[in-house]
Interface confidence: low
């Protein structure tokens, strides 16, 4: 997001700057990669809370023995095939933390918008070079959120083999172009994924039971564009038993009408459909075959939209999307800047939540809180947000179980284990577990009612519209009902 929200509990230190990445040294005294404790429960029956308590107790009892050996870092591996590159021709790569006892592999695609012309790619290269080049990548990265190996931070898949694939192709992971006289930059997003998978087969992926391709923002869209292709690749290479699944976070965008129409000048104010239309040509972008066949030539941009590509996918995909996604609002020129908003903008924002909710109606595995935010799965406090009393790691666990049980004919959801979790309340932050909002001047936390009034929300008018007493409405907002 834009700095208004924080993801820390009271009293915690602010997270370090996301840019530029800082080099972190490997823990002293570790001569080789540290193995995780080799337990692997691909589907856990029974009470998850009790299971987690046992895991936590086990982890804590083992902790003193291995304190010297703990190493949370994922280590950089540049691709051996140096013809598969970032925009500037430097080799692409991935960060890996192996977990020898596990047959689960999590491959995470980083996000970071895109560029779609020589001009805005030049500008991106000047100001965000790490998103176009591997030249300054640090040797290690710390796994956070779903990439963490700590059961407390990652109750879902803490023991998996973790792979972070940095985004350096600026093409929403769709490009399949090579260096040419005409192009200053190359766009190889789809080829990078293919090559990473190829190289990981030699590092243990060949023995995997489940490969979860996850991603946030442009990486989330990248999941939708590439998940079937990864499954196909593994099948063709002789690994049909590896179950390929997708987890798309904050990459489910709408081609709705912009709040204020703007000319297509830069990456953000350009309507996403127009940017992608131009981008596909510039990147030589690839979309899933089954989706492409549904649209005529020149209309492939439709396949970048979750609600259009999702029905054509073969692999199971879990969709995570804030109902009031900041990237969507920015693209729609309706983002909240801290200034009071006009009534028209409020209605527009509410309507966005309504439209997004509609597109998720037929997505059985989804988690969509009514919050104003962007990205969640690699944030340290990704466990904090709940929809209808269920957290995201819990929903993912239920999804795993439903897939594990799917050979059984029954299509009914598992009792007490929901996987379709979409908020129904209509305002940004009407869910009380949304990430904390802080007043950007005082740093004070704000509750929902304070936030909405701060943004110019007219309690009287809205209460009238809803046929409620203003005090009743404020009470409802504060409690998140």
């Amino acid at each position: 997001g834009e700095g208004r929200k924080t993801w820390r509990r009271r009293g915690q230190q602010p997270a370090p700057a996301p840019l530029p990445p800082q080099r972190t040294e490997a823990a002293p005294g570790t001569g080789q990669p540290v193995e995780s404790f080799p337990l692997d429960f691909t589907a856990v029956e029974g009470n998850m809370d009790s299971f987690m308590a046992q895991v936590k107790s086990l982890a804590q009892s083992l902790y003193p023995c291995s304190a010297q050996q703990l190493n949370e870092d994922l280590r950089l591996h540049l691709l051996l095939n140096t013809s598969v590159t970032c925009n500037d021709g430097s080799p692409a790569g991935y960060y890996l933390k192996e977990s020898k006892g596990s047959r689960r592999w999590l491959l995470f695609l980083e996000g970071g918008w895109y560029c779609f012309s020589r001009e805005n790619c030049d500008s991106r290269y000047d100001t965000m070079r790490r998103l176009m080049s591997s030249k300054d990548w640090p040797q290690t990265r710390t796994g956070t959120g779903i990439l963490s190996s700590q059961p407390e931070e990652n109750p879902y898949w803490w023991n998996a083999n973790m792979v972070f694939i940095p985004y350096c192709s600026s093409d929403v992971w769709s490009g399949a172009s090579s260096k040419s006289e005409k192009n200053e930059y190359v766009f190889m997003g789809a080829l990078i994924i293919r090559e990473v998978v190829q190289e990981l087969l030699g590092r243990g992926l060949s023995g995997a039971k489940v490969l979860l391709l996850a991603g946030s923002s442009a990486g989330g869209t990248g999941v939708l564009l590439n998940v079937d292709r990864v499954a196909e690749q593994l099948e063709q290479l002789g690994y049909p038993a590896i179950q390929v699944r997708g987890l798309a976070d904050s990459g489910w965008f709408l081609d709705n009408k912009q709040y204020r129409r703007t000319d297509c000048v830069d990456t953000v104010t350009c309507a996403p459909t127009e940017a992608i239309r131009r981008g596909i040509r510039y990147w030589n972008g690839m979309v899933p075959e089954r989706c492409r066949s549904q649209f005529k030539e020149g209309e492939e941009w439709n396949c970048f939209l979750g609600y259009k590509v999702y029905p054509t996918l073969r692999c199971p995909v879990f969709v995570v999307q804030w109902l009031f996604d900041e990237a969507q609002l920015t693209a729609d020129n309706a983002h909240l800047t801290g200034q009071p908003v006009q009534e028209g903008q409020w209605l527009y924002i509410q309507n966005l939540g309504h439209e997004l909710r509609n597109t998720l109606k037929d997505v059985p595995a989804s988690f969509a809180p009514a919050c104003l935010s962007h990205e969640i799965i690699i944030r340290s406090h990704w466990t904090d947000v709940q929809v209808k009393g269920t957290s995201l790691p819990r929903a993912l666990h239920c999804w795993d179980r439903s897939l594990h049980d799917s050979h059984k004919a029954s299509k009914t959801p598992l009792k007490g284990c929901p996987i379709h979790l979409v908020d129904s309340c209509p305002w940004p932050h009407c869910n009380p577990s949304c990430p904390t909002i802080r007043d950007q001047f005082t740093g004070q936390e704000m509750n929902v009612a304070q936030f909405l009034m701060h943004m110019g929300f007219d309690v009287q008018t809205v209460a009238q519209q809803q046929g409620l007493e203003p005090s009743k409405l404020l009470g409802m907002l504060s409690s998140g009902s």
Epitope: P20, Y125, D126, T127, D266
Partner: antibody, heavy 119, light 111 residues
Framework: EVQLVESGGDLVKPGGSLKLSCAAS????????MHWLRQAPEKGLEWVAY????????SYANTMKGRFTISRDNAKKTLSLQMTSLRSEDTAIYYC????????????WGTGTTVTVSS | DIVLTQSPASLVVSLGQRATISCRAS??????????MHWYQQKPGQPPKLLIY???NLESGVPARFSGSGSGTDFTLNIHPVEEGDATTYYC?????????FGSGTKLEIK
């Protein structure tokens, strides 16, 4: 040590010309976009001109367009600013600064060189 | 061009207290999840020195007493607790698009 050192500042008459130089050391000069900025006596900071790492993008403040020319020699690690048709309002301390390429802020500044335009 | 309005123009703060300087942009300087607003300190006879980059990130070597916040159009530099050596001028600057522009500066005095 990362360092930028400007030179070439002088007293010059209105309408005259002057060339400022900036010598870089301690970092890979050819990797960075570079800027010239200035500060008139007792005034705030004003951006003058920008040149990208490979000299493909040049940009100037409106009041300096056509009068000032920014250039660089990556082999010699030098940045230059050729100023012509100088006016009294161009009197200032001129700084060269390195642009950080993960955000566009100025993370390294020179100590400045003084240009005085007066008859 | 994006105009940055810095306030107050001058500020008197007691030793050990909090100094808060604001900077408002005429247009949003946030894009793709990053806010392109930076803060500098300039002492007399010296070039400016970077304190905070991308709205809230502390430049290495700068004391943790300095912090930045904000997004979109409204940004704040906080200094707490203020020390004697902090008495000087502070500028905000954006790099969202060319041309980059600066605020007019805030002169901090310690009493």
């Amino acid at each position: 040590e990362v360092q930028l050192v400007e030179s070439g500042g002088d007293l010059v008459k209105p309408g005259g010309s002057l060339k400022l130089s900036c010598a870089a050391s301690g970092f890979t000069f050819s990797d960075y976009g570079m800027h010239w900025l200035r500060q008139a006596p007792e005034k705030g900071l004003e951006w003058v001109a920008y040149i990208s790492s490979g000299s493909t993008t040049l940009s100037y403040a409106n009041t300096m367009k056509g009068r000032f020319t920014i250039s660089r020699d990556n082999a010699k690690k030098t940045l230059s600013l050729q100023m012509t048709s100088l006016r009294s309002e161009d009197t200032a301390i001129y700084y060269c600064a390195r642009k950080n390429y993960n955000g566009g802020y100025f993370d390294v500044w020179g100590t400045g060189t003084t240009v005085t335009v007066s008859s | 061009d994006i105009v940055l309005t810095q306030s107050p123009a001058s500020l008197v703060v007691s030793l050990g207290q909090r100094a808060t300087i604001s900077c408002r942009a005429s247009k949003s300087v946030s894009e793709s999840g990053y806010s392109y607003m930076h803060w500098y300190q300039q002492k007399p006879g010296q070039p400016p020195k970077l304190l905070i980059y991308l709205a809230s990130n502390l430049e290495s070597g700068v004391p943790a007493r300095f912090s930045g916040s904000g997004s979109g159009t409204d940004f704040t530099l906080n200094i707490h607790p203020v020390e004697e050596g902090d008495a000087t001028t502070y500028y905000c600057q954006h790099s969202r698009v060319l041309p980059p522009t600066f605020g007019s500066g805030t002169k901090l005095e310690i009493k």
